[in-house]
């Protein structure tokens, strides 16, 4: 190989090993004879070398830096080569170092031609291996701008005062050319400023200076998104640091197209704007730190660009200034994630503060759209708290939970609503009474309606749920021991229209002792499926919990348990299963942890089942599945 | 009123059997545990063998597994205990006791024996 | 299986004395314990179950307490009927078992 440097060229060459690997042989540069690991040609210098091994590759590496001085002279702009050129070269990894000096008064632009830059953060790397390296100068200080790819926004970055620009190729790289030019432009004004250019939906993802170290104190980058113009906008910020300031605060500003507000100023943990149409700056301003803890500023933000949809033209009102104790969350639903790009879905406050997920409060109006692709990965999520703090005021009190018409003109599906229903402990109790029968939810008989309700107990400490519930059933009220919560789940768009099957009334009861009873009117028609709360999981320890069971005059109901034995084991107490006859008050006892279940036994009267657990083995717990026919009384069986 | 009465005790020889029976009323059989408890002459109680209400489960003291089982006949209102190779040391009194089931500080239990016949001896000699 | 060892196993007491008889067993039972009382050539009588509740018709002078190992019956002021054997069971599954008897007898 020769090299050789013109005198006036400013370029030295360096060549040395790399990253030490665990190669048996070593290998050395060849000069004239001499073995040797290292070789510096400075300007003026002709230097002929081999190598002695047959892949130098995997051993050296070679740094051509060019010094440009624009401070006594004038500047050499435009388009920047790779010189020596590349086919001179050995081919060895390869880093160009430009080092440009400049006056501070003076502006240098560099100008990335397409396929554009694309800013990587700790821990990544380029596809190809081929990356920059871009670094700024506060003084005597390198500020490090970034690293980058190819293949992304970045079209520009200004600086003053100088630029460091590094380049490197890996050794099977063909690429000869730098792929920038430089430009002189005014005093910017600040630490640099960036320009990403989108040409179409996708998302950026941008770091402040030296990150993820600090930011240098009390300086100002800007970067500045040239957007199409159908196209939105949104920022989110993926990772930020505040420092310890002592004069100034740290924020964001942005210059909006069409704000009367321009800048807007955004503190760092504020929702950053969404839903931006056209080209618009965002800028980092630091602050006096506090010298003795001064702490760190970093930032890493993420650009979104898309299309918008309808909807994001049209504002929706969400009046909860009568609700009490509520608030609605619009979310997206949990989906498996792609690793094509997915346009952002966001839901807006008042059109600007844009974010993947928003929640409402009561006691106010909300305005809000939608920034989103497809309004079906959104969902909603409402809860609200109808609580009794003095028993004496609520006693025989009536709630309607139904869920208030505004929710449906929201263009977002209804997931969960829950209310969250609360009574002072152990002086009141609650009853559920469904507009319409319900049904449980079994294996046996699964509910195939729209919507369910699910029953479960809102004590912290309780694991108890007690069950999914369903109109068009037989379950004619619900009542419970203490603080539920009800959860209206919907299962499809079809919720909709039938809503008005929705519709349970909450009352405040005397306060009673099991857990929860099942007022039960079995239809005549078929079998009613009843299972113990907490099914698979076991009745909780100590439980109890009691059926009600209506049977008409006209009619025999025939009880029927799923198994033969229930499987329980008793660490403490034991499990009772209690059939009652309401008329006679005659009772059956049967220890569920010992006995056989009976066998299907036919009533003519209304009757009670209880069951009373014990504190279960840990994997041997009770679950009880039985169910209910009801067939015509004839004359020999009275 | 509720009550119990045991029969089929008397005077049986070593290795020999006997079969006690306990006829229950003024109540419902079905829904409580019954036990079998002795008494040696002039010592204390012993408790030999229980059974649940729908018989489903059984139990036994030590000194008599094996040898005793203890069954019940619902529909008769009838508790049972076959004794088989009989011991002198089996010489006793045997009541038939029934089991109350209570709630105590919410946990559902057997709480002890409330309702006893009066016993019938059981002499194992030859 | 659970040992229960009742104290005394005599006692000596007057008409109107606080007695106090004492039942330990071998192993924790937590509150599963009974007191019965039998008269000779009588049936037990169950007189407390769960270590302290009183059986229906059982006078009030009798009481129970104790948790885990350490159990105790007390007859506040004695009776002429209240002369007779008192024994312990544990009710902590099965196999039951009783202490060996207290017999209380007239001073």
């Known amino acids: 190989f020769e090299i050789a440097l013109p005198r006036e060229s400013n370029i030295t060459v360096l060549i040395k090993l790399g990253t030490p690997t665990l190669l048996a042989k070593p290998c050395y540069i060849v000069i004239s004879k001499r073995h040797t690991t290292m070789l510096s040609i400075k300007p003026g210098e002709r230097i002929l070398f081999t190598f002695s091994c047959q892949s130098p590759e995997n051993h050296f590496v070679i740094e051509i830096q060019k010094n440009i001085d624009c401070m006594s002279g004038p500047c050499p702009f435009g388009e920047v080569q790779l010189q020596p050129s590349t086919s001179l070269l050995p081919t060895l990894n390869r880093t160009f170092i430009w080092d440009v000096k400049a006056h501070k008064s003076i502006g240098l632009e560099l100008q990335f031609s397409i396929p554009r830059l694309r800013q990587f953060g700790p821990g990544e790397s380029c596809p190809d291996g081929v990356t920059y390296s871009i670094s700024g100068r506060i003084d005597a200080t390198v500020v490090r701008i970034g690293t980058f790819c190819s293949n992304g926004t970045v079209s520009r970055i200004k600086m003053q005062e100088g630029v460091k620009m590094a380049l490197h190729l890996p050794w099977f790289h063909p690429r000869n050319v730098s792929g920038f030019s430089i430009a002189n432009r005014s005093s910017i004004k600040r630490l640099c400023i960036i320009e990403s250019v989108f040409e179409g939906e996708g998302s950026a993802t941008l770091m402040s200076a030296n990150y993820p170290e600090g930011f240098p104190e009390d300086e100002l980058m800007t970067w500045q998104f040239v957007i199409p113009a159908h196209l939105r906008a949104s920022v989110s910020f993926l990772n930020f640091n505040l420092s310890n300031c002592e004069r100034k605060e740290e924020r964001v500003e942005y210059y909006i197209p069409g704000s009367t507000t321009n800048p807007e100023v955004f503190k760092l943990e504020d929702k950053q704007p969404g839903n931006m149409a056209g080209n618009f700056n965002l800028s980092l301003q630091g602050c006096d730190q506090d010298a003795q803890n001064p702490g760190i500023l970093r930032l890493q933000f993420q650009v979104l660009v898309q299309h918008p949809q309808n909807e994001s033209n049209k504002i929706y009102v969400v009046d909860l200034s009568n609700e009490r104790a509520t608030s609605l969350t619009i979310e997206p639903r949990p989906v498996k994630q792609s690793r094509k790009f997915v346009p952002g879905c966001f839901v807006c406050l008042e059109s600007r503060t844009c974010s993947t997920n928003l929640t409402l409060t009561s006691g106010s109006k909300h305005k809000i759209s939608f920034l989103c692709d497809n309004l079906t990965r959104l969902w909603m999520n409402v809860e609200k708290n109808i609580s009794c703090t003095d028993h004496r005021y609520c006693q025989r009190k009536s709630y309607s939970l139904q869920v208030p018409s505004d929710i449906f003109h929201l263009p977002v599906e209804l997931h969960d609503f829950s209310w969250k229903l609360l009574v002072p402990k152990d002086r009141l109790s609650l009853v559920l009474v469904p507009a319409q029968k319900l049904q449980q939810h079994t294996h046996e008989k699964p509910c195939n309606t729209s919507f369910s309700y699910l029953v479960a107990s809102a004590i912290p400490s309780q694991d108890l749920y007690f069950g999914s519930f369903c109109p068009g059933g037989s379950i004619e009220q619900i009542q419970v021991k203490q603080n539920i919560s009800v959860t209206l789940r919907t299962f499809a768009p079809s919720f909709r229209q039938e809503a008005s099957r929705q519709g349970l009334t909450v009352s405040f009861i005397p306060y009673f002792k099991e857990e929860g009873v099942f007022t039960v009117t079995p239809d005549t028609k078929s079998k009613v499926y009843l299972r113990t709360p907490n099914w698979d999981r076991g009745l909780p320890s100590l439980t109890s919990v009691s059926w009600n069971i209506s049977v008409p005059r006209d009619q025999v109901a025939c009880l029927t348990f799923f198994k033969e034995r229930t499987g329980v084991v008793c660490q403490t107490g034991r499990a009772f299963m209690i059939i009652q006859e309401q008329r006679t008050r005659a009772e059956e006892i049967f220890s569920l942890d010992e006995d056989a279940l009976p066998k299907p036994r036919f009533h003519h009267h209304s009757f009670w089942v209880n069951i009373s657990n014990c504190s279960p083995a840990s994997g041997k717990q009770l679950d009880l599945l039985f169910w209910v026919t009801l067939t015509p009384r004839t004359v020999d069986l009275t | 009123e509720v009550q119990l009465l045991e029969s089929g005790g008397g005077l049986v020889q070593p290795g020999g059997s006997l079969r006690l029976s306990c006829a229950a009323s003024g109540f419902t059989f079905s829904n409580y545990a019954m036990n079998w408890v002795r008494q040696a002459p002039g010592k204390g109680l012993e408790w030999v063998s229980a059974?649940?209400?729908?018989?489903?489960?059984?139990y036994y003291a030590d000194s008599v597994k094996g040898r005793f089982t203890i069954s019940r006949d619902n529909s008769k209102n009838t508790l049972y205990l076959q004794m088989n190779s009989l011991r002198a040391e089996d010489t006793a009194v045997y009541y038939c006791?029934?089991?109350?089931?209570?709630?105590?500080?919410?946990?559902?239990?057997?709480?002890?024996?409330?309702?006893w016949g009066q016993g019938t001896t059981v002499t194992v000699s030859s | 299986d659970i040992q229960l060892t009742q104290s005394p196993s005599f006692l000596s007491a007057s008409v109107g004395d606080r007695v106090t008889i004492t039942c330990r067993a071998s192993q924790g039972i937590s509150s599963y314990l009974a007191w019965y009382q039998q008269k000779p050539g009588k049936a037990p009588k169950l007189l407390i179950y769960?270590?302290?509740t009183l059986q229906g018709g059982v006078p009030s002078r009798f009481s129970g307490s104790g948790s885990g190992t350490e159990f105790t019956l007390t007859i506040s002021s004695l009776q002429p009927e209240d002369f007779a054997t008192y024994y312990c069971?544990?009710?902590?599954?099965?196999?039951?078992?009783f202490g060996q008897g207290t017999k209380v007898e007239i001073k």
């Open positions: 006791a029934k089991e109350s089931i209570t709630m105590v500080r919410g946990v559902m239990d057997y709480y002890g024996m409330d309702v």
């Open positions: 059974i649940s209400g729908g018989g489903g489960s059984t």
């Open positions: 069971q544990h009710l902590n599954r099965f196999p039951r078992t």
């Open positions: 769960a270590a302290s």
